[in-house]
Each structure stands twice: as C-alpha cells, then as structure tokens.
C-alpha cells in the first residue's frame, strides 16, 4: 500500500481542516488508514482522523481543531496499521478556505431594488470576520447567456441592484462565496443558491411615454 | 469528574530529597500532557516539570534542570516529580496540572502539597 | 526566556465596575496566551485561551483580547467573587513557557 498522491490540507481557519489524498489502488481508507495530527509542541496526545473514501483511491479526512492561531503548525502522520505512510506538516493560516456564507436572502419588496443579503459564516471574535469579501453570482434559469458576477469588497455582507439590470418576468437564483485577502485564502465553496421571480414593470410614465412614441410612428 | 491529587509534600533539610506523586483521575491520563507548577509564600506560579502524555519528552527550567524528575506510570495515572539537592528556594506549594487537549494551557489543577526545605 | 508583565499590580475595584488587566510580552507571541484566576489557598482556575478564548464554565463577563506582545484580559461588571489575582501565561514555542508575575484584584 502506498501513497500515490500525497495528503494536501485547507483549513476554515475555524475548526475544521480538510485533507485529500489518493492512494495507489482502491482503499477502504475508514478501516485501513488512520491520519495523525499533533499541533508542534503540544503535549498532549495526537489527534486521530479515521478518513473516508472519496472515490475508489481517494480518501480525505476532516481534522477537528481548536480555533487556529496564525503560527500554529500540525505535524501530519498517515498510518496503514503500523506502517507509516507519509510523514509531512500543515500550516492552517497558510491554506485557508473560507466557509461558505449562508442565509443568502433575496428581498424583492422595494420594487425597483433588488437587496440581496447573507450571512458572514464566521462569529466576531474570528480574525476572518472582518476580512471577508464576497462574489454574488446571478444567473438565469431560462437563458443560460444570462450570468453575472458581482464583487462585493466592502465588509458588509449584501449587495443592491437595480431590478432593471435583469429581464423581467422570468426566474433567477443566486448564490454567493466569500475569500480573505489577508491570508491569500481560496475561494469558499458557493453558498446553497436562492431563487426568486423578477416581476420588475417599468414605470406607468415609461409605459405612457414609449406607446405614445410608438403610436406616433 | 476530573480530579488531580498530590502528595509527598513535607519538611526536608537543604540537600535532601522529596518525590511528589499526583494521582488522576476522571479522564484519560495517558492522552494529556502534564506538568508540575510550584509557588513559593506571597509569590507567583513558577513552570518546574513538563511531560508529555507518553511520557518521552520531559522539560524544565534552569532553576532546577538536573536536580529534579519528572515522570509518570500511564498504567497507574499517576504523575511524579522526584527533587533532589533541594534548596531553601525550592520551598513552595507544588502544584500538578493537566495540559489542555489543543493547547498547552493547563486546564485542571491539583489542590497543591507544600513542601519546605529548611534546616 | 520571554519574559511576561502585568499591570497594574494591584487595583481595588467595586461590584458592577468594568476591569481591565494587561499582560505584555518581550517578544511576539502571536495568540499563545492563557489567563487564570487564583483565590487565597487555592489553585488557579482556568478562564482564558488562545487570549480570548473562554475556557468551558467561564462567566461571559470575562473576555481576553490582543495578539503580539499586548493582551487585555476584561471583567465588564465585577461581582464580589471575582477578587483574587490573575496570571497571565504564555505557551509559545517550546516548554518554556512562564507566568506573568500577577495582578491583585481587591473588591472595593
């Protein structure tokens, strides 16, 4: 049994890490592997993750962990019983991808304004709170052409956009992922997507003006 | 319920020799990282003894490196600190104490035992 | 060593009253910073890590902050068991960790 691709690790920056590696043939990584972890000059015993399959050869693990400091630094060991793998280490502020925002919130009752809004997925007194920016996506259900990205680089987490932007009368959904630039971290995964009808109308004075222009001609 | 108790404390002539022992209890000994912190009258915490849960990587100040010992038996739950070549400095409150599971801050302590190095 | 300091050294404060202690370090320990509360005869209890972290059982009047060398550790409304004195310890690095030299909390 050997490794074939070795482990690679993100952390939330929060709590869990998440590592992936392949090995060289199917595994039944929850009961052949065992990956672990011991933060550098901790005294107290290691940590075990039992891993689970991700595709035949893949395996991937989630490392619980207390909330990370910048300097923290994890030694990584992988186990087949009591043949050691693969010895490596990880650094979390170093490979951060950000949870994914959640709530994502459409409000559609100012009728010209579209006001989207989510939830930063990190509590307060997390270093990442505050240093989150996000991307909205919005698409179409109908015309798959119909696909845009909006960066959002202030703090708070919602975006305005005028309703006319979008086609009227028909369905779109949207989604949102956040990044830190601060530690150079990955994108989140997207958020689950929300939908909503666009029903924007032109103004009645529009209506009026353009059929009286249209009557003209 | 997590419980740390120490005992070995006493009177001891400057040059003479203590062992301290701290038994545990209500959690799984072997796993934690334990350590011995001594407080002498009206003074601070000082760090004396460091292990770590298997008992393979031990650490201590200068103030004491070569005089004394720590060790354990997984087997038991118990902790220990042997001190030899004690001094009248070395007299103190000497507490045991549990390194917290993800940080090397100590989460439980013992109710201390007092030793004093005296002629 | 990295050597740790406290201030102020002793303050006598009234039930209801916001305090504040500072620990300081002589050089960056990032967030390795634990406090604790010891009263007379007793041993310390644990309140505090990673600087602001409350440790399970800690009333949420107590808060850590700060990051580096300066750390505040805050009660906002005192109540008459929070007298006693409050360590600061650092566990950065190897096991050579130490305690600040104290704070004494008197209530008025």
């Known amino acids: 049994m050997k490794v074939l691709q070795e482990p690679t690790c993100v952390s939330d920056y929060m709590s869990i890490s998440t590592c992936e590696w392949k090995m060289n043939g199917p595994t039944n990584c929850s009961t052949e592997l065992r990956l672990l972890y011991q933060l550098v000059f901790l005294l107290s015993e290691a940590h075990t993750c039992i891993p689970e399959n991700n595709g035949g050869a893949g395996c991937v693990c989630h490392l619980l962990m207390d909330d990370v400091v910048s300097a923290d630094n994890y030694t990584l060991d992988l186990w087949a019983g009591q043949q050691l793998l693969w010895k490596g280490s990880f650094k979390p502020s170093e490979h951060v991808k950000p949870r994914a925002p959640g709530n994502l919130t459409v409000h559609t009752n100012v009728s010209d304004t579209l006001l989207l809004t989510w939830s930063n997925p990190y509590p307060p007194d997390n270093y990442l709170y505050n240093h989150l920016t996000y991307a909205v996506n919005i698409w179409s259900e109908n015309d798959p052409a119909d696909f845009r990205i909006y960066n959002v680089t202030y703090l708070e987490p919602s975006l305005r956009i005028a309703a006319s932007t979008l086609k009227s009368g028909i369905s779109y959904r949207a989604r949102v992922r956040a990044w830190a630039q601060c530690y150079n971290t990955t994108w989140s995964e997207w958020s689950p997507s929300t939908k909503w009808h666009n029903s924007y109308r032109e103004p009645f004075e529009q209506h009026h003006h353009h059929h009286h222009h249209h009557h003209h001609h | 319920e997590v419980q740390l108790v120490e005992s070995g404390g006493g009177l001891v002539q400057p040059g003479g020799s203590l062992r301290l022992s701290c038994a545990a209890s209500?959690?799984?000994?072997?796993?934690?990282?334990m350590s011995w912190v001594r407080q002498a009258p009206g003074k601070g915490l000082v760090l004396v003894a460091t292990?770590?849960?298997?008992?393979?990587?031990?650490s201590y100040p200068d103030s004491v490196k070569g005089r004394f010992t720590i060790s354990r038996d997984n087997a038991k739950n118990t902790l220990y600190l042997q001190m030899n070549s004690l001094r009248a400095e070395d007299t103190a409150v000497y507490y045991c104490?549990?390194?917290?599971?993800?940080?090397?801050?100590?989460?439980?302590w013992g109710q201390g035992t007092l030793v004093t190095v005296s002629s | 060593d990295i050597q740790m300091t406290q201030s102020p050294s002793s303050l006598s404060a009234s039930v209801g009253q916001r305090v504040t202690i500072t620990c300081r370090t002589s050089?960056?320990?990032?967030?390795?910073l634990a406090w604790y509360q010891q009263k007379q005869g007793k041993p310390p209890r644990f309140l505090i890590y990673?600087?602001?972290t409350l440790a399970e059982g800690v009333p949420s009047r107590f808060s850590g902050s700060g990051s580096g060398t300066e750390f505040t550790l805050t009660i906002t409304s005192l109540q008459a068991e929070d007298f006693g004195v409050y360590y600061c310890?650092?566990?950065?690095?190897?096991?050579?960790?130490?305690f600040g030299p104290g704070t004494k909390l008197e209530i008025k």
């Open positions: 292990i770590n849960s298997n008992g393979g990587s031990t």
């Open positions: 990673n600087a602001k």
């Open positions: 209500g959690f799984t000994f072997s796993t934690y990282g």
């Open positions: 050089e960056n320990i990032y967030s390795y």
């Open positions: 104490a549990r390194f917290f599971r993800f940080r090397n801050a100590m989460d439980y």
């Open positions: 310890q650092h566990y950065y690095g190897p096991p050579t960790w130490t």
